[in-house]
Each structure stands twice: as C-alpha cells, then as structure tokens.
C-alpha cells in the first residue's frame, strides 16, 4: 500500500481467483483513543472500533472510502483504491491501446518545435467517475523539472456504437535548451483513477523525436506568363523554432489531381518557394519536416490550381 | 579549411558536409516507427556517447558571442564518433551489406574533422577508452543505438554550421 | 539486489594450480562483465583479468601466461584458474562486476573476498 | 600500463576535519568527446572488499553520505572528505578504467588523529 495523495491509498493486489489479497492497517488521524468506529462509504454499518481498523482487501468490495468517527463526528478519512496485476502485468482497463506507433501505446506525445513546451493525449471509452494527474521530469534518476497542467477532455467522438473521449495535457520543460542535444528522455507519467481502479501510464522520449511542425502558412500561387507553371510560395509556421537560419525546415510539394488514382507529382526544396506545373482541378499541397532530423512532417497546407 | 588561430572555419563546405552527414546518418538507419531503445542497459550506452550540451556554446548566441567552444566541441564528437564506427562493433561480424552508407557516414565524419581542424592548430589529441569487446549478437543493438545518438549529434551540428554559413560567414 | 560469492581451497601447494569460483545471484549474467582482482596480505589491489558478457577474455600482461578465466552460465558461475603458483600468488582473490556498456565501467559490486595461501 | 600514483600514503586527520587523497595517472583518463573521466574512488576497511565511492571521477555512488566528493580531470585527481567521521578510517583507492590493465593506487591509510 502506498500513499497517492492525503488520505488517498493505493493497495497493490495480485487479481487471480481465490487469491489471498492485502493485509491493511488504517489509522484514525486523530489524537482520540476511545470511542472510535469505523464505517466503509455512505454505510452505517460498523465495521470495527478503536483507533486502527485491519482489513483483508481483496476485491472492489473492499475498497472504498474508510471513515472513522466519534460520538457522530467525523474524524478523518482514508480512501483506497486497487491496482490490479494480472500475471505480472499491471492493468491497463482505463485507456485505450491507440496502436500508433505501436502496440500497447496508450500516451501519444506531439511537440510544435523545440521551446520544451509538448502536448500529450490519450483516448477512453469512459464517461463518468474519471480522473487524470500528470506528472513529467527530464531524466528519471536525477530528473530536471517539467510543468504540466491539469488534463482535460479535448474531443469527443462516435465510434460505431461507442463514444469515444480523448483527454490532453500541455507540459513545459523548466529549464528547456533548444539548441542542445538531447542526452535523457523526458518521462511523462499520468495517473488515472476511475470509479476505484487506479492505473498508471508512462511514455519515455526526446521532443525531437515528437517534433511535428504546424503546417506551412501564407501559401500561395502566382501564375508564370505564358507558361502552365506557377511559383508557389510559403513561409514557416509562426509556431516554429526561431532563428529560421538555425532550425531550418524542409519542405514537400504536391501536385494532385482531383481523382485520387491520379499520379502526384512531389518536389523536395529547402527554400520557401517552387516552381510546378499545375494541372486544371488540381491542389497543390506543401507540408515541412525538420532539415536535419527525420521526425514528423507537418500535416499539409493546400490551395486549389484554379 | 580553416585558417589557424581562433578564426573562423569554412562555414559552406561545413555546412554542406553536415547537412550530408545527416543524410547518410539516417540512410545508415532509418527510423523504423519510433523504436523504444529505452531498455535496460541504453542508458550507459547513450550516456558513453558524446552530446552537445547546453553550455557548449552552440545555440545561435553562443555562435555569435565565440564559435570556437562549439565547434571543438563538434570536432571532439567527430572524431569520437569516427572512432566508434571505425571499431569492431561496424566492422566486426555480423558484415554490414555490401552498399551500407556506415563507410560514407565514416569517410564523412573524419572529412568534415578535418575542415575543422585548422592546419598549425591543433585541439588537444583525442583519446577514447578501450571499448568494450562486443559479441555478434551484441553489436547489431549497439550499432542501432549508436547511429540512433548520431543523428542527433550531427542535426545539432548541420544546424551551427547552417547558422554559421548563413550569418557568420565572412 | 546483485551478490557475488566466491569459492575455492583455501590452501594450494606451490607449483599447483589455484582454482576459485564466483558465484553470482541477483540478476541476469548476460549483462555483466566479472572481473577477478587480488590482494596480497596487507598490500594493495592488483587487477588479474576479465570476461566479458560475451566470453572473451582480457588479463593482466603480467599473469597472462598463467591465467584463464571462464564462465558456466548455467550455473551462474565464473571460474578463476591460476597455474604454477608461488608464495607470491598468496592473496585475498575478490569477483567484481561492472555493468555492460560501450566502454568497460567500474566495479560496483563486489564478492566477500577468499584468501588462498600457497604453502606446502 | 598506465601507473596510478596516490599521495600520501597515509594521513592522519581529527574528527570534524576535512580530508584530501590525490591519485596521479600516468596519462590522462578525459575521454573528451564524452566528457568523461574514467577513475574511480573506493573505500576499504579491514577484512571487508572495498566499497565504490565515487566513479567518473566525481559523481557520488548512491548511498555514499555527501561529506565524499571526488573532483579533478585528466592527470590530476582528489577525493575530499569535508568532515571526518570515527567510519571513515579505512585504507581509499583511486582505480582507473580508461585502458588494459585496469590499474589502481597504492592506497592510501586515513586516521584519526
């Protein structure tokens, strides 16, 4: 049993039928020695007397906010909640497995460029009776600070008889260095509590592997005298890195047509311009990836050829 | 190449060596999805890596107040990267193929030293510890982890260099 | 929490060959390399050699030609084996361990130590 | 061989006092592409194996009380005790890493006076 919060208690328990459960010992959190009951949530049921109450927790049953009162008053009170292990491995009930980038990847982590400020997400099916905490550090063994805010519900979606709920964070590194390499992964861990059950979901990585820029702004097209061809140009999305000399962007241009059988014509460039021929009902769409190091490219910006 | 002295390096062929080592880099290993590398035992090897750090003076600041801290900086990386893809854990079994861009990714790494390196001037001589004997089935995970470091390495250098060229250049 | 432990006669004829083994529990072999050091009775450490976590071997150029280290992975054990021993060779013998990496680190873990005199 | 050379050999310092042990290498143990320093420092006391202390010159083992701090680079390297304590008496060694064979000091006897 380990202390998540005051008064809140998470008892760790091997979940296997017939299996023994915890031992656990509450303590009243008061300087009375007599006269004290013990009552387990909205029941008035007596479940024992004296400043200590045991209990063997073996299932949801037991679990449950544990008050100890006198004479009709309310003294303290001590909630416990399970951590389910199943055959070793910790349950993960409350998130949803979003497969991207791989199995098991229930914390997916995006960053817009190098500040040390990042946005993770996550997806449930549960409604009610739903909390989230976060918590980040750089580093694990001696770690260096990350703020992050209160997790909230961004979207909602209907997926086929279900409705799915996805929840984000923002966090910002304390002491971010842009231009540094970096040599320890920021660790991002959020504690989720339904109803009960408590987990925990970790993610490991470095922003420059979560780097995925904003789209390219400003594009836009200006036709060549006599010619098929127009120059297009773009300029780096306000949210990138600065200076542009220094955290440079590639970019990639696309031609394509209105069918999507249509063959699309791609132009890698690191200028902010190029020159491509546009084909009538054609978009031409630009997206920017990092210069030097291969993370995400951007989601595309698009005008129409006409 | 760079003149001797404290002046600068050539900023342009340095810029565009970089900015190929960072291709050869991830040709030499493109990421396959996100690979976790965050097992047991990666801390020490990312640890024994070298890294620009935040106080190397390699951010645009740093470059413009004195460039030569970051860039023996960059120099030492070099070579102890060179060092590390020169030694039995590339060359050794199991062979990397034939047309592997690790030989290029070598030959560039000591090309671009050596634009650093400016004649008459010499940074202190580089010496590396004894590695650790590595066996075949060892060597493919850290051949992974210390190109995976790499690329990080070399997208800090590509951009000083870009930087540099770009507003540094006489 | 990793232990080392090792084992071997207390007592070896000089000319013979000194056997010892380090017993390891704790943790996965796989990730360790054992290194064997020594100490003469009030005098100071002395490095003998290593194997590492492939099975190779490194000693010391001073006791090359007499040593072999070796390792039995199903039994968690490495051996030491010291050939034609003299007085000189009657020491403390310890295993320590340091943690696989690049580069060979530090010994942070290390056996109780066992004292073998040679003597006829 | 690289030869680690400790000074002094024995030192004899009162409760409460601070203690310094120097460890000369040969040659230099910086790896300056990765910064490190490849010495470590140990403790040893009668009859037991000797403790890790400190390892990459100056970073402390966890669990070592922070009265030992280990400093110095390349040739030139000190283990400090701020504030003796009566456990401290013990025989410290300087051990390097960087190359075959591992070498170490001859060990310095730390006493109370």
């Known amino acids: 049993i380990w202390e998540l919060k005051k008064d809140v208690y998470v008892v760790e328990l091997d979940w296997y039928p017939d299996a023994p459960g915890e031992m656990v010992v509450l303590t009243c959190d008061t300087p009375e020695e007599d006269g004290i009951t013990w009552t387990l949530d909205q029941s008035s049921e007596v479940l024992g007397s004296g400043k200590t109450l045991t209990i063997q927790v073996k299932e949801f049953g037991d679990a449950g906010q544990y008050t100890c009162h006198k004479g009709g008053e309310v003294l303290s009170h001590s909630l416990l909640l399970l951590h389910k292990k199943e055959d070793g491995i910790w349950s993960t009930d409350i998130l949803k497995d979003q497969k991207e980038p791989k199995n098991k990847t229930f914390l997916r982590c995006e960053a817009k460029n190098y500040s040390g400020r990042f946005t993770c997400w996550w997806l449930t099916t549960i409604s009610t009776d739903l909390t989230f905490s976060v918590k980040s550090s750089r580093g694990s063994s001696d770690p260096q600070g990350v703020t992050c805010g209160a997790a909230t519900l961004s979207a909602e979606r209907v997926r086929g008889d279900n409705k799915e709920y996805e929840y984000s964070v923002e966090c910002q590194e304390d002491s971010a260095c842009p231009a540094a390499e970096e040599s320890l992964p920021i660790e991002v861990m959020v504690d989720a509590v339904h109803k009960l059950k408590y987990e925990n979901y970790t993610s490991s990585f470095f922003i420059r592997d979560i780097i995925k820029p904003d789209p390219p702004k400003n594009l836009q097209l200006k036709p060549l005298k006599n010619s098929r061809q127009v120059e297009v140009s773009w300029e780096y999305p306000d949210t990138w890195s600065t200076p542009h000399s220094y955290f440079s962007l590639t970019f990639c241009v696309q031609v394509q047509g209105k069918s999507k059988r249509e063959k699309k014509d791609r132009v890698f460039t690191d200028k902010t311009s190029a020159t491509v021929i546009c084909r009538k009902n054609a978009s031409i769409s630009v997206r920017a990836q990092d210069r030097y190091y291969s993370s995400s490219w951007s989601e595309w910006a698009s005008v129409p050829c006409s | 190449r760079a003149v001797p002295g404290g002046s600068s390096p050539a900023w342009t062929q340095c810029q565009q060596l970089s900015q190929k080592l960072c291709t050869l880099a991830w040709s030499a290993h493109p990421l396959v999805g996100h690979m976790d590398l965050r097992e047991e035992g990666d801390e020490e090897t990312t640890n024994d890596v070298p890294h620009i750090q935040c106080g190397d003076g390699c951010d645009p600041q740093g470059l413009r107040d004195n460039s030569q801290f970051c860039l023996q900086r960059i120099h030492q990386g070099l070579i102890f990267y060179e060092k590390l893809l020169g030694s039995d854990i590339f060359t050794g079994e199991p062979s990397l193929l034939p047309d592997s861009p690790v030989g290029q990714l070598h030959a560039s790494l000591l090309g671009l030293s050596q634009l650093l390196q400016p004649e008459g001037h010499h940074w202190e001589t580089q010496q590396i510890p004894s590695l650790s004997p590595s066996q075949p089935w060892q060597r493919l995970l850290l051949r992974f982890k210390i190109l995976r470091s790499l690329q990080a390495f070399v997208a800090v250098a590509a951009r000083v260099f870009a930087h540099g060229a770009a507003t540094l250049s006489p | 929490q990793v232990q080392l432990q090792e084992s071997g006669p207390g007592l070896v004829k000089p000319s013979e060959t000194l056997s010892l083994t380090c017993t390891v529990s704790g943790g996965s072999i796989s990730s360790y390399n054992v290194h064997w050091i020594r100490q003469p009775p009030g005098k100071g450490l002395e490095w003998i050699g290593v194997i590492w976590t492939g099975g190779s071997t490194d000693y010391n150029p001073s006791l090359k030609s007499r040593v072999t280290i070796s390792v039995d992975t199903s039994k968690n054990q490495f051996s030491l084996k010291l050939s034609s021993v003299t007085a000189a060779d009657t020491a403390v013998y310890y295993c320590?361990?340091?943690?696989?990496?690049?580069?060979?680190?530090?010994?942070?873990?290390w056996g109780q130590g066992t004292l073998v005199t040679v003597s006829s | 061989d690289i030869v680690m050379t400790q000074s002094p050999d024995s030192l004899a310092v009162s409760l409460g006092e601070r203690a310094t042990i120097n460890c000369k290498p040969s040659q230099s143990l910086l790896s300056s592409g990765n910064r490190k320093n490849y010495l470590a420092w140990y403790q040893q006391k009668p009859g037991q194996p000797p403790k890790l202390l400190i390892y990459?010159?100056?970073t402390r083992q966890s669990g070592v009380p922070d009265r030992f701090s280990g400093s110095g680079s390349g040739t030139d390297f000190t283990l400090t005790i701020s504030s003796l304590q009566a456990e401290d008496v013990a025989v410290y060694y300087c051990?390097?890493?960087?190359?075959?064979?591992?070498?170490f000091g001859q060990g310095t006897k730390l006493e109370i006076k």
């Open positions: 051990l390097q890493h960087f190359n075959y064979p591992w070498t």
């Open positions: 990459y010159a100056s």
């Open positions: 320590a361990r340091d943690k696989y990496g690049l580069f060979p680190g530090y010994f942070d873990y």
